[in-house]
C-alpha cells in the first residue's frame, strides 16, 4: 500500500512538475524590465526564450519572435536545449510511469517489469528536473551578469545634460515557475525510485517444504502454526529451505538487483 502511494504521489508530483516546465518554457516573462530606475515607464519590456514583448501606454502588447537561429546568443540556445531535453525526457518518463503504476493492470506484466519501468521513469524525471533547473539557472546567471554590466554604464549623455537610461532586465516569473517545476519533477523522480525498491520482488528460490506427522502427537492448529508434544525427539519434522521467508520490512534491508539508486 505504501509503495503504491509513493509511486502514485511520485507520478502526480512529476506530472505537475513537467506541466510547469512546459509552461515555463513557453512563457514570455523569462526576463522583465527592471523598473528601479524608471518606475513610471509607459513602455514595459519583457523577454522569453522564443520572443520579446513590449507593452505600450495604450495597453497593447507587441511580441516579436526571434526569427534567427545563428544570431542568438549561445547561452540562450543552450537554455532552450536544456528545457526541451527536460520536456522530452519528462514526457517519456510520464509515458513509461503510466504503465509502471501498480494500480494499473496491463496483461500479465510482472512486478519485476513494473519495478524496472518505475526506476526508469524515476531516473528520467530526475534528469528532466535537473535539466530544467540547470536551464533556468544558466539564464538567471546570464541576467545577473548583464544586469551588473548595464549598471556599470547605466547613464550616457552629452555633457551630463541628457540622460539615456539603458534598459536593464531582472528575473521574470518564468524563472520561478521553472525552478519550482524542476524541483517538483526531481522530487517526483526520487519518489519513483524509492517506490521501485518496494516493488522489486525478492529473488528467493523456495524449495518444497515437507511436513511429516509423527504419530498422534502432532496437531495442526489454525493459522498455520505447528504444535508438537515432543520437540526434542521430533527430528523428522524439518523444514528444508535455502533462505527463510522475511517480512516486507526485512525484504527492503537486503540488497537486490534494483538497489543501485
Amino acid at each position: 500500500m505504501a509503495v503504491t502511494a509513493c509511486q502514485g504521489l511520485g507520478f502526480v508530483v512529476s506530472l505537475i512538475g513537467i506541466a510547469g516546465i512546459i509552461a515555463a518554457t513557453c512563457m514570455d516573462q523569462w526576463s522583465t524590465q527592471d523598473l528601479y530606475n524608471n518606475p513610471v515607464t509607459a513602455v514595459f519590456n519583457y523577454q522569453g526564450l522564443w520572443r520579446s514583448c513590449v507593452r505600450e501606454s495604450s495597453g497593447f502588447t507587441e511580441c516579436r519572435g526571434y526569427f534567427t537561429l545563428l544570431g542568438l546568443p549561445a547561452m540562450l540556445q543552450a537554455v532552450r536545449a536544456l528545457m526541451i531535453v527536460g520536456i522530452v525526457l519528462g514526457a517519456i518518463g510520464l509515458l513509461v510511469s503510466i504503465f509502471a503504476l501498480k494500480c494499473i493492470r496491463i496483461g500479465s506484466m510482472e512486478d519485476s517489469a513494473k519495478a524496472n519501468m518505475t526506476l526508469t521513469s524515476g531516473i528520467m524525471f530526475i534528469v528532466s528536473g535537473l535539466c530544467a533547473i540547470a536551464g533556468v539557472s544558466v539564464f538567471a546567471n546570464m541576467l545577473v551578469t548583464n544586469f551588473w554590466m548595464s549598471t556599470a554604464n547605466m547613464y550616457t549623455g552629452m555633457g551630463g545634460m541628457v540622460q539615456t537610461v539603458q534598459t536593464r532586465y531582472t528575473f521574470g516569473a518564468a524563472l520561478f515557475v521553472g525552478w519550482v517545476a524542476g524541483g517538483l519533477t526531481l522530487i517526483g523522480g526520487v519518489m519513483m525510485c524509492i517506490a521501485c525498491r518496494g516493488l522489486a520482488p525478492e529473488e528467493t528460490n523456495y524449495k518444497a517444504v515437507s511436513y511429516h506427522a509423527s504419530g498422534h502427537s502432532v496437531a495442526y492448529k489454525p493459522g498455520g502454526f505447528k504444535a508438537s508434544t515432543g520437540f526434542g525427539s521430533n527430528t523428522k519434522n524439518k523444514k528444508i529451505y535455502d533462505g527463510g521467508a522475511r517480512t516486507e520490512d526485512e525484504v527492503q534491508s537486503y540488497p537486490s538487483k534494483h538497489d543501485y539508486v
Epitope: 524590465q33 524608471n38 513610471v40 515607464t41 509607459a42 513602455v43 519590456n45 523577454q47 520579446s52 513590449v54 505600450e56 501606454s57 495604450s58 495597453g59 497593447f60 507587441e62 516579436r64 541628457v162 540622460q163 539615456t164 537610461v165 539603458q166 534598459t167
Partner: antibody, heavy 115, light 113 residues
Framework: QVQLVQSGAEVKKPGASVKMSCKAS????????MHWVRQAPGQRLEWIGY????????SYNQKFKGKATLTVDTSASTAYMELSSLRSEDTAVYYC????????WGQGTTVTVSS | DIVMTQSPSSLSVSVGDRVTMTCKSS????????????LTWYQQKPGKAPKLLIY???TRESGVPDRFSGSGSGTDFTLTISSVQPEDFATYFC?????????FGGGTKLEIK
C-alpha cells in the same frame, strides 16, 4: 469605425464636482487602456491618467491625484472621469483617448467653472 | 517628468513651402527592447481634437499624406512637411509616449504667410 463619443458641455460652480462619460464603439473595449487628457485655454495638453478596462487599474499624473477619479463600465463600453473640488483653473476641454499609439480621441467635453 | 520643448512656437509659410519643426525631450525616448523611439506627432485644428500623424518618431499613421515625415532619435526629433497644403495650417504637437506622466510639447502653430 473606432469612435469615442463624449458627454456634453458642463458649467459648474467652484467647489462642485462633475462626472463626464466617454462611450467607445468599433473595437473591443477591454483591448486598450483609456487615457484622459485636458487642454486648458492657452495651455499645452496635459495627461491626466489612464484606466485599464480589464481590471479597473489606474495610473494618474501626480498633479491630478485627488482631483480626478477614473472608472469604467465594461458592459456599456463606457469610461468615466469625475473631477472634484472644481476651481476656475479646471476650466478646460477634457478628452478621452484610446487604441494603439493613442490614435483615437473623443470630441472633447468642455467644462466651465464659474461663479 | 520628461519635458518636451518645441520650436519654433509659430511658423508663417506659403502653400507649397517645405517646413521643418523640431521637438526636444529632456530624456531619451528610445526603447532598446524594440529599437523604437516613443515620440508621437499630432495635428490640431481650432475647436477639434488632436489627430495622430506620426508614431514611433517616423511611422506615418494610415491615411496620413506622405508629405508628412518624421525623423530623429533619442532626444531630438523633427517633423517635416515637404509641400504645405492649405489644409495643413494648424498647430502641431509632439508627445512623449515613453514615460509617465505622458507629456506634450507646447506646439508649433503653422500660419499662412
Amino acid at each position: 469605425q473606432v469612435q469615442l463619443v463624449q458627454s456634453g458641455a458642463e458649467v459648474k460652480k467652484p467647489g462642485a464636482s462633475v462626472k463626464m462619460s466617454c462611450k467607445a464603439s468599433g473595437y473591443t473595449f477591454t483591448d486598450y487602456n483609456m487615457h484622459w487628457v485636458r487642454q486648458a485655454p492657452g495651455q499645452r495638453l496635459e495627461w491626466i491618467g489612464y484606466i485599464n478596462p480589464n481590471n479597473g487599474g489606474t495610473s494618474y499624473n501626480q498633479k491630478f491625484k485627488g482631483k480626478a477619479t477614473l472608472t469604467v463600465d465594461t458592459s456599456a463600453s463606457t469610461a468615466y472621469m469625475e473631477l472634484s473640488s472644481l476651481r476656475s483653473e479646471d476650466t478646460a476641454v477634457y478628452y478621452c483617448v484610446t487604441t494603439r499609439y493613442l490614435a483615437v480621441w473623443g470630441q472633447g467635453t468642455t467644462v466651465t467653472v464659474s461663479s | 517628468d520628461i519635458v518636451m520643448t518645441q520650436s519654433p512656437s509659430s511658423l508663417s509659410v506659403s502653400v507649397g513651402d517645405r517646413v521643418t519643426m523640431t521637438c526636444k525631450s529632456s530624456q531619451s525616448l528610445f526603447n532598446s527592447g524594440n529599437q523604437k523611439n516613443y515620440l508621437t506627432w499630432y495635428q490640431q485644428k481650432p475647436g477639434k481634437a488632436p489627430k495622430l500623424l506620426i508614431y514611433w518618431a517616423s511611422t506615418r499613421e494610415s491615411g496620413v499624406p506622405d508629405r508628412f515625415s518624421g525623423s530623429g532619435s533619442g532626444t531630438d526629433f523633427t517633423l517635416t512637411i515637404s509641400s504645405v497644403q492649405p489644409e495643413d495650417f494648424a498647430t502641431y504637437f509632439c508627445q512623449n509616449d515613453y514615460s509617465y506622466p505622458l507629456t506634450f510639447g507646447g506646439g508649433t502653430k503653422l500660419e499662412i504667410k
